[in-house]
C-alpha cells in the first residue's frame, strides 16, 4: 500500500479540483445527509441541483434538481434513492442519499442554476464507510438520540470536513485509480508520440499496456447511467 501512497502524492496535482472540497462520510446501507450552505440573497430565485462529477475534467452529470417552481424548492424531490430540498430563506441546500452503497462514493457538486449556466456552491467528496454497527439495534431508521450516542455511526448526522488549500486529500481508491490511469495514459501517450517521432512511425500504434484502468477488483468507479432529472 505504501508504494501506492507515494504514487498518489505524485498524482496529487491531478486532484486540484478537490481543493476546498468538503468530505461527507456515510455508512453503507444507511442514509447520508449532505448540506450545502449558500448566500440566499446572491442565489435568490435560482433553482439548485446535485450532480456527480464524471472524471477530473469531465461533465457533472445531473442527479436531481429542486422543484421547477423556485417557490416550491422546499418540497423534497427524488431521483431513485437521492433526494433534494432547498431552504431558500436560510440558504441551505440539503441532499439525502438513502441506502448508501460503495458505488455512491465519489465527487459531486451542489449547483445553483441560472439559465443554462450553473454556479458551484460546494464540491463534495462522498466517502462510504463499512458499517461499524452491523448488528446495531436501531436498524436503518434514524433517531437523533442514536446519532448523539454514536456520533459518526449514524450518518444522517454526517461527518464532514473541508479539504483546505495545502491539505493533501486522500480520496477513495476508485478515484485515485482513475487519476493514476489518466496520469499513466498521458505518460504512455507522450512516450508513444516520442517513440513515433524518434522512429519515424505513424503516431497511431500505442505499445500494448497491461494496465486495465476500468477494472479495480475492489472498487469500481461506477457512473450513474441514464439518470433523469425528475
Amino acid at each position: 500500500m505504501e508504494p501506492l501512497r507515494l504514487l498518489i502524492l505524485l498524482f496529487v496535482t491531478e486532484l486540484s479540483g478537490a481543493h476546498n472540497t468538503t468530505v461527507f462520510q456515510g455508512v453503507a446501507g444507511q442514509s447520508l445527509q449532505v448540506s450545502c450552505p449558500y448566500d440566499s440573497m446572491k442565489h435568490w430565485g435560482r433553482r439548485k441541483a446535485w450532480c456527480r462529477q464524471l472524471g477530473e475534467k469531465g461533465p457533472c452529470q445531473r442527479v436531481v434538481s429542486t422543484h421547477n417552481l423556485w417557490l416550491l424548492s422546499f418540497l423534497r424531490r427524488w431521483n431513485g434513492s437521492t433526494a433534494i430540498t432547498d431552504d431558500t430563506l436560510g440558504g441551505t441546500l440539503t441532499i439525502t442519499l438513502r441506502n448508501l452503497q460503495p458505488h455512491d462514493a465519489g465527487l459531486y457538486q451542489c449547483q445553483s442554476l441560472h439559465g443554462s449556466e450553473a454556479d458551484t456552491l460546494r464540491k463534495v467528496l462522498v466517502e462510504v464507510l463499512a458499517d461499524p454497527l452491523d448488528h446495531r439495534d436501531a436498524g436503518d431508521l434514524w433517531f437523533p438520540g442514536e446519532s448523539e450516542s454514536f456520533e459518526d455511526a449514524h450518518v444522517e448526522h454526517s461527518i464532514s470536513r473541508s479539504l483546505l488549500e495545502g491539505e493533501i486529500p486522500f480520496p477513495p481508491t476508485s478515484i485515485l485509480l482513475l487519476l493514476a490511469c489518466i496520469f499513466l495514459i498521458k505518460i504512455l501517450a507522450a512516450s508513444a508520440l516520442w517513440a513515433a517521432a524518434w522512429h519515424g512511425q505513424k503516431p497511431g500504434t500505442h505499445p500494448p499496456s497491461e494496465l486495465d484502468c476500468g477494472h479495480d477488483p475492489g472498487y469500481q468507479l461506477q457512473t450513474l447511467p441514464g439518470l433523469r432529472d425528475t
Epitope: Q30, N99, G139, L141
Partner: antibody
Framework: EVQLQQSGPELVKPGASVKISCKTS????????MHWVIQSHGKSLEWIGG????????SYNQKFRDKASLTVDKSSSTAYLELRSLTSEDSAVYYC???????????????WGQGTSVTVSS | DIVMSQSPSSLAVSVGEKVTMSCKSS????????????LAWYQQKPGQSPKLLIY???TRESGVPDRFRGSGSGTDFTLTISSVKAEDLAVYYC?????????FGGGTKLEIK
C-alpha cells in the same frame, strides 16, 4: 387524500403465521417511512418497527425482532407486516402508520390505518 | 428504552373546562442540533385509530383545532385543551421518537362529566 387501508380481521391457530397488508393511496409510498404499531386489548401502543420503502431498509423493536417481518411492494403501494409463530399473547390490533422522515418531523406518525384485529386461538 | 410516564391515568371534566395532562420521559428528548424535542401527542377516540395532534412537542398538526396546545421541552411535557368539547372524549398518548425504539406513554383517558 392520504389513506392507509388495512386488510381484514384474522383468526389464526397458534404456531401459524399471518401477513397483514396496508394499501396506501394519496401520496408516494417511497417518500415516507411506514411503521407498525400493536395495541393489545385495552392497553397502550407499542412500536413494532418501521421500514424505508425507497430502500427496503428496516428497523425493528428488539422485542418483536423474532416475531415480525416488514416488507413493502412499491409497485402496488402496499406495506406488509408478517407475524410468525403466533401465540395467544399476539392477539391484538395491529396498525400501520405513515411516518414522516427525520428532516421534517422525525417519525411522528401522521396517518394511521384503521387497524387489523388478529385473534390467535385454537 | 426511554420510559414515557403519563398522568393522570384518567380524568373527568365538564364541557368548556380547561384540562391539562402531563407526560414525562426518562431522559431528555431534546436534540441539540435543532433544539427540538422529539415528542408527539395522539388522540384515540373509542373504536378508532390514533390521530396525530402535536409533533415536536408543540407544533399542531394541520387540521387540529387550536384549543389543543402542546408545551414543554427536554423531559417534561404538557398537553392542554383550553375548552373541552364533548367530541374530545378519548385516550391521549404521548410518544417519543428521539431514541430507538420509539415508545408511547400509558395514556390519559379523558371522560366528560
Amino acid at each position: 387524500e392520504v389513506q392507509l387501508q388495512q386488510s381484514g380481521p384474522e383468526l389464526v391457530k397458534p404456531g401459524a403465521s399471518v401477513k397483514i397488508s396496508c394499501k396506501t393511496s394519496g401520496y408516494t409510498l417511497s417518500e415516507y417511512t411506514m411503521h407498525w404499531v400493536i395495541q393489545s386489548h385495552g392497553k397502550s401502543l407499542e412500536w413494532i418497527g418501521g421500514v424505508i420503502p425507497n430502500s427496503g431498509g428496516t428497523s425493528y423493536n428488539q422485542k418483536f425482532r423474532d416475531k415480525a417481518s416488514l416488507t413493502v411492494d412499491k409497485s402496488s403501494s402496499t406495506a406488509y407486516l408478517e407475524l410468525r409463530s403466533l401465540t395467544s399473547e399476539d392477539s391484538a390490533v395491529y396498525y400501520c402508520a405513515r411516518g414522516d422522515d427525520s428532516y421534517r418531523r422525525g417519525y411522528a406518525l401522521d396517518y394511521w390505518g384503521q387497524g387489523t384485529s388478529v385473534t390467535v386461538s385454537s | 428504552d426511554i420510559v414515557m410516564s403519563q398522568s393522570p391515568s384518567s380524568l373527568a371534566v365538564s364541557v368548556g373546562e380547561k384540562v391539562t395532562m402531563s407526560c414525562k420521559s426518562s431522559q431528555s428528548l431534546l436534540y441539540s442540533s435543532n433544539q427540538k424535542s422529539y415528542l408527539a401527542w395522539y388522540q384515540q377516540k373509542p373504536g378508532q385509530s390514533p390521530k396525530l395532534l402535536i409533533y415536536w412537542a408543540s407544533t399542531r398538526e394541520s387540521g387540529v383545532p387550536d384549543r389543543f396546545r402542546g408545551s414543554g421541552s427536554g423531559t417534561d411535557f404538557t398537553l392542554t385543551i383550553s375548552s373541552v368539547k364533548a367530541e374530545d372524549l378519548a385516550v391521549y398518548y404521548c410518544q417519543q421518537y428521539f431514541s430507538y425504539p420509539p415508545t408511547f406513554g400509558g395514556g390519559t383517558k379523558l371522560e366528560i362529566k
